[in-house]
Amino acid sequence: EKAMVDGSWLDLAKRSKLEAQPFAHLTINATDIPSGSHKVSLSSWYHDRGWAKISNMTFSNGKLIVNQDGFYYLYANICFRHHETSGDLATEYLQLMVYVTKTSIKIPSSHTLMKGGSTKYWSGNSEFHFYSINVGGFFKLRSGEEISIEVSNPSLLDPDQDATYFGAFKVRDID
């Protein structure tokens, strides 16, 4: 009986540790996408509607803030699209890029952790164009560090929650 009690206590401890594991899945806020063709920081994301969720991490001022030291898997998916109903592309040659950046407040510094994308020729003869970028990686993050997303050509972003999103989840502690 004691073994059983010990076992269930262990399960409970494991479960509560798992429930405390930080994670975030943030989806683009379509009502507040910046315009332009230059590289811009995307600051408007949902954290609590649709597919978007956050636990034991903080979302503030457009940045995902780490609350616990650890090794995290970071990911971002960015979709670009253009349909002729919205007008013509002013240029048919495009650089479609995403940058996942880490900013440290304690030692003021910024590093690009991941980038992805391509140069594209989106011909004016086509009715519809689409391009998707997915990046992911495993990083050591410290409490207080901030993750942000920058993209080129934000006015071409696909505003759907299943198209443009980023997130993180803690995989293990730092030994």
Epitope: T85, S86, G87, A90, S155, L156
Partner: antibody, heavy 126, light 103 residues
Framework: QVQLVQSGAEVRKPGASVKVSCKAS????????IHWVRQAPGQRLEWMGW????????KFSQKFQGRITVTRDTAASTAYMELRSLRSEDTAVYYC???????????????????WGQGTLVTVSS | EIVMTQSPSSLSASVGDRVTITCRAS??????LNWYQLKPGKAPRLLIY???SLQSGVPSRFSGSGSGAEFTLTISSLQPEDIATYYC?????FGQGTKVEIK
Amino acid sequence: QVQLVQSGAEVRKPGASVKVSCKASGYDFSNYAIHWVRQAPGQRLEWMGWINAGNGNTKFSQKFQGRITVTRDTAASTAYMELRSLRSEDTAVYYCARDSSNMVRAIIIAYYFDYWGQGTLVTVSS
Amino acid sequence: EIVMTQSPSSLSASVGDRVTITCRASQSISRYLNWYQLKPGKAPRLLIYGASSLQSGVPSRFSGSGSGAEFTLTISSLQPEDIATYYCQHTRAFGQGTKVEIK
């Protein structure tokens, strides 16, 4: 204030060419696209083409492809539309119009024509 | 190629009347629809863009609505200076125009 001032009326014989100018003032010419639209007597407005005044990129209606040339002189803040091999059905009022999208902030030519020239009557008659 | 169809082609109304012009697209165009006013010998004027946004300087008696393939331009109280031909437009396609006259 924003103004587009077009050149005066022209009369041409069939087979000839015409070049219409559109001088812009009151804004940074290079930051916007200029469209050319025409209206033949009793007809609807008809889009002909655009030029991105910043980089010189152009797009034309299939109907005018091969007959139309649109250029710009950024120093003079002026756009030009030349139509060749004129026929009687090209008799129309030709307008230039500014696209509302500021190319510094946007990558899409939106086809919202927020300012127009006064129009240039081109008559093609033998 | 998208085709824009306006109705009616002409209308006659009294000063102060509410006037409605309809524009249909041959396929869905979301809200990418603009309205222009044309008066003889004058530069055309953008009234409404993006189906319902009023262009700066345009009187508030003009309004636009609709999305998808059906749109309307409404003049809430017709004024003598509103005598003109009105055109709807989506990118490269214009409607055939609606001529508005005073009774």
